[in-house]
């Protein structure tokens, strides 16, 4: 019948279509315990089934829990949907280490190009800081007007980087020359950043606490709703999303209707026993110190790189950096790089650089 | 107009198990969750868990992890509760009760099945 | 969990006057801008019947001498002005987090 015609304002007398004033034609009445993904459905297939609270309905038709951004490096991209978990990003001067599903996992400053590199390309919400040499006869110091800016939160003194390598990471095939690689992390406490912007009273994102419309028997087409802090999975069953309650651990990615919740050590500490969608085992992280000159390089989601000083002058460890603060934790996926013989697991000295077997236990750089 | 008729009084041995059943009519069986609260003799109210009659889905108390069993058949739109290892705790009046879709209230209820536990 | 701290435990009201039932949740109920806080009322031998949703919502065929209000952690009941029929067990429940929980119910009597 037709559709859009202001005057069709019966539908032709059709129950199971009304007539929208707005947008001037007859739309398609969602069956009761079913919410509209529209604001004029046109067919069942635009009806849905309402999960609970900070839940989406994933592919699958399950509700899941939508990520949250609760922490303290993270801010809220898009809110959490009805059809789409909240997407978190990492706060402005931080950039991604390593990407966790709908958020990061783990946030690291942007570097700050040391002496004699400039800024090739800023960090950005994904990449770290690119650096470059400076050309000759420009001031190393104030080579470009990026690197002339103070950093948006204090910096470990260049001395004293924390080792790290990157989450994704081809090079842990590289020769590595009298150590480790090590990238630049800011060690001042993280500060809350501005708040994200809420979806709480957002009807973009309302998850369907709105009246709902009949649901008649025998609808296919009836999805369902999950309680709050459950997330429909991949197999559409609600389940619950993980907790970060313990005092260890932090909320990575918040819990959305389609993803749940995931947690990470807090800043300080290394995961040594992974979970799902979280860690069993947190440990102190142990932190190097070493000179450092910046090699550049330009890939996604990995931090500025670091060639280690010549043989003879291997980094000693201290237990924090010297402003006493901790680093922010590494997820099980990262490791400092390490030779051949990393793969064994040996006692660990203070002094040793230190990286995570597969199986998360730490292993010592045999150097 | 919607109604839940729930099953008749249990009086079940120590250590056994029972199911009692909710018969959903009036309204899509499929579509809502159904929900079971279990309240004792001059008690408060305790939420057991609730399910998914379109496709089985279920959430649970933790407390009731191992002890209650929700399943649910479409065709005959019944819900059912299934109680494990019975001890004098568990008598009590079981309710199951519609949840709405939208605020999450339980708008219709069953008339409550009283299971009694004695030896 | 989220405790809910409900108060009185029991309250005498004379008829005509104003019954107030307090609930206190242990944590935040918000949820996309309402509370979801839910009110019932339960009377001897019957199923609780819902009366109050999304914290200050009645339910259809509800009489409009209840009320609820409230926001984030605490929720009242109102009923005023009280009848006979009223006499009854109330029930505050959150459906923030699962579990679900009750609060543990407030006895209302008339003086």
């Known amino acids: 019948f037709p559709q859009d015609r202001p005057f069709e304002d019966t539908c032709h007398g059709n129950p199971s279509h009304y007539y929208d004033k707005a947008v001037r034609r007859c739309c398609y009445r969602c069956p009761m315990g079913l919410f509209p993904t529209q604001q004029c459905p046109q067919r069942p297939t635009d009806c849905r089934k309402q999960c609970e609270p900070d839940y989406y309905l994933d592919e699958a038709d399950r509700c899941t829990a939508c990520v949250t951004c609760s922490r303290d490096d993270l801010v809220e991209k898009t809110p959490c949907a009805w059809n789409s978990s909240r997407v978190c990003e990492c706060r402005p001067g931080m950039f991604c280490s390593t990407s966790a599903v709908n958020s990061c996992a783990r946030c690291f400053f942007h570097s700050v190009c040391p002496a004699g590199m400039i800024v090739k390309f800023p960090g950005t919400a994904q990449k770290n800081t690119v650096c470059e040499p400076a050309s000759p006869g420009v001031s190393p110091a104030c080579a470009s007007p990026e690197n002339c800016k103070e950093p948006s939160s204090g910096t470990i003194p260049q001395a004293k980087p924390t080792p790290v390598s990157p989450a994704t990471s081809s090079a842990s095939t590289m020769p590595v020359r009298g150590g480790t690689r090590l990238a630049q992390e800011a060690a001042s406490k993280l500060t809350r950043a501005p708040d994200s912007p809420s979806s709480v009273g957002r009807p973009s994102s309302d998850p369907g606490l709105s009246p709902t419309q009949p649901c008649p028997e025998g609808s296919g087409d009836c999805r369902k709703q999950c309680e709050p802090d459950y997330y429909l999975d991949e197999a559409g069953r609600c389940t619950a999303c993980v907790s970060c309650s313990r005092d260890d651990l932090v909320e990575k990615t918040p819990c959305a209707w389609n993803s749940s919740r995931t947690c990470e050590c807090r800043p300080g500490m290394i995961c040594a026993t992974s979970a799902t969608n979280s860690c069993a085992r947190c440990v102190p992280y142990p932190i190097c110190a070493a000179e450092t000159v910046t090699k550049p390089q330009d890939m996604a989601e990995k931090d500025t790189t670091f060639e280690a000083p010549p043989l003879g002058t291997q980094p000693d460890c201290n237990p924090t950096p010297e402003n006493g603060e901790a680093p922010a934790s590494t997820s099980p996926t990262q490791s400092l790089l390490v030779d051949s013989q990393a793969s064994k697991t040996l006692p660990i000295p203070t002094s040793a650089p230190v990286a995570l077997s597969s199986t998360g236990k730490p292993v010592l750089d045999a150097g | 107009e919607v109604q839940l008729q729930q099953s008749g009084a249990e009086l079940v041995r120590p250590g056994s198990s029972v199911k009692i059943s909710c018969k959903a009519s009036g309204y899509a069986f499929s579509s809502y969750w159904m929900n079971w609260v279990k309240q004792r003799p001059g008690q408060g109210l305790e939420w057991i868990g609730q399910i998914y009659p379109g496709d089985g889905d279920t959430n649970y108390n933790g407390k009731f992890k191992g002890k209650a069993t929700l399943t649910a058949d479409k065709s005959s739109s019944t819900a059912y509760m299934q109680l494990s290892s019975l001890t004098s705790e568990d008598s009590a009046v079981y309710f199951c009760?519609?949840?709405?879709?939208?605020?999450?209230?339980?708008?219709?209820w069953g008339q409550g099945t009283s299971v009694t536990v004695s030896s | 969990e989220i405790v809910l701290t409900q108060s009185p435990a029991s309250l005498a009201v004379s008829l005509g006057q104003r019954a107030t039932i307090s609930c206190r949740a242990s944590e935040s109920l918000e949820y996309y801008g309402t509370s979801l806080m839910l009110w019932y009322q339960q009377k001897p031998g019957q199923p609780p019947k819902l009366l109050i949703y999304s914290a200050s919502n009645v339910e259809s065929g509800v009489p409009a001498r209840f009320s609820g209000s409230g926001s984030g952690t605490d929720f009242s009941l109102n009923i005023h002005p009280v009848e006979e029929d009223d006499i009854a067990m109330y029930f505050c429940?959150?459906?923030?987090?699962?579990?679900?929980?009750f609060g543990g119910g407030t006895k209302l009597e008339i003086k």
């Open positions: 429940q959150q459906r923030r987090k699962v579990p679900s929980t």
């Open positions: 009760a519609r949840r709405i879709n939208g605020n999450f209230a339980m708008d219709y």
